[in-house]
Interface confidence: low
């Protein structure tokens, strides 16, 4: 019998390189049974994760899994950083691994920024 615990399937150390100015959807894959849990997104700021309360989110339901989506419309330079989704289910809080967005300039979309570039272009730095 399959477990009915809620599970969040963000891979450890997952990353996305995304283009500033484009729309983007950050997906949190959620597995649950009968009752869909309450899921939220937060953005890491040092050791704390700041809840993203005023952001557009939506659910996408598929046959064996659901996705809780954080919408970036469009991506801005300071969206750079690490995000985590968490689910409240039967008084339990389940947290995902963090996923990191690398926001890249139109001019360097084909390459991940080097440490030198990140030092010279502050908006690429983790905030």
């Amino acid at each position: 019998k399959e477990s009915c615990d809620v599970q969040l399937y963000i891979k450890r150390q997952s990353e996305h390189s995304i283009l500033a100015g484009d729309p983007f959807e950050l997906e949190c894959p959620v597995k649950y049974c009968a009752n869909r849990p309450h899921v939220t997104w937060c953005k890491l700021n040092g050791t704390t994760c700041v809840k993203l309360e005023d952001r557009q989110t939506s659910w996408k339901e598929e046959k064996n899994i659901s996705f809780f989506i954080l919408h970036f419309e469009p991506v801005l330079p300071n969206d750079n950083g690490s995000y985590r989704c968490s689910a409240n289910f039967q008084s339990n809080l389940i947290e995902s691994h963090s996923t990191t967005l690398y926001v890249t300039d139109v001019k360097s979309a084909s390459e991940r920024p080097s440490k030198d570039e990140m030092a010279s272009r502050p908006w690429l730095l983790y905030r």
Partner: antibody, heavy 116, light 107 residues
Framework: QDQLQQSDAELVKPGASVKISCKVS????????IHWMKQRPEQGLEWIGY????????KYNEKFKGKATLTADKSSSTAYMQLNSLTSEDSAVYFC?????????WGQGTTLTVSS | DIVMTQSHKFMSTSVGDRVSITCKAS??????VAWYQQKPGQSPKLLIY???TRRTGVPDRFTGSGSGTDFTLTISNVQSEDLADYFC?????????FGAGTKLELK
């Protein structure tokens, strides 16, 4: 040629509401956010907010929350901004603009005059 | 909110001159800055984005520079059609904000 065509000038009384339109042509309406700006004489531009026509999601400048409501009609490729409880402070030229966060394409502007 | 300060409300120039319009951000915005030109009765026109990238079709006498908090729009060999208002805008974070504008006029 990408174009944003705004509705004509409006003269309205204090306390009333007004709805300004911005019709898009030349590109797929649902591909880009539509932003709205306010400009008063001898003053700079203020960003009001945007709507993403693909799903109707919006983001507002806190200063304009409760004042402006942004909507979009995909069938006519038109974005709308409704301004309510109008006062003389709302008298301005309002622009719609497109192409994400820096604005390649602008409407011609709609002049709103609030006067009794 | 990030405040974009254009310290000169007016700048006087002559045809053929070189003029620099400055803009200062209240906090680090990286290179997420655009410059616009606006003539009376018209909507603004994008000149520069990412602080220094000239929009296609904009004459190469318009040059943008800067990063962090200090930005400059330089117009070399000023032409009469360049007499207009110039605004900077940051798009590093919401709300998007604009400078108050600098009006370029003839001496």
């Amino acid at each position: 040629q990408d174009q944003l065509q705004q509705s004509d000038a409006e003269l309205v009384k204090p306390g009333a509401s007004v709805k300004i339109s911005c019709k898009v042509s030349g590109y797929t309406f649902t591909d880009h956010t539509i932003h709205w700006m306010k400009q008063r004489p001898e003053q700079g531009l203020e960003w009001i907010g945007y709507i993403y026509p693909r799903d109707g999601s919006t983001k507002y400048n806190e200063k304009f929350k409760g004042k402006a409501t942004l909507t979009a009609d995909k069938s006519s490729s038109t974005a709308y901004m409704q301004l309510n409880s109008l006062t003389s402070e709302d008298s301005a030229v309002y622009f719609c603009a497109s192409s994400n966060w820096n604005f390649d394409y602008w409407g011609q502007g709609t002049t709103l005059t609030v006067s009794s | 909110d990030i405040v974009m300060t254009q310290s000169h409300k007016f700048m006087s120039t002559s045809v053929g001159d070189r003029v620099s319009i400055t803009c200062k951000a209240s906090q680090d915005v990286g290179t997420a800055v655009a410059w616009y030109q606006q003539k009376p009765g018209q909507s603004p026109k994008l000149l520069i984005y990412w602080a220094s990238t000239r929009r296609t079709g904009v004459p190469d006498r318009f040059t943008g520079s800067g990063s962090g908090t200090d930005f400059t729009l330089t117009i070399s060999n000023v032409q009469s059609e360049d007499l207009a208002d110039y605004f900077c805008q940051q798009y590093s974070s919401y709300p998007l904000t604009f400078g108050a504008g600098t009006k370029l006029e003839l001496k």
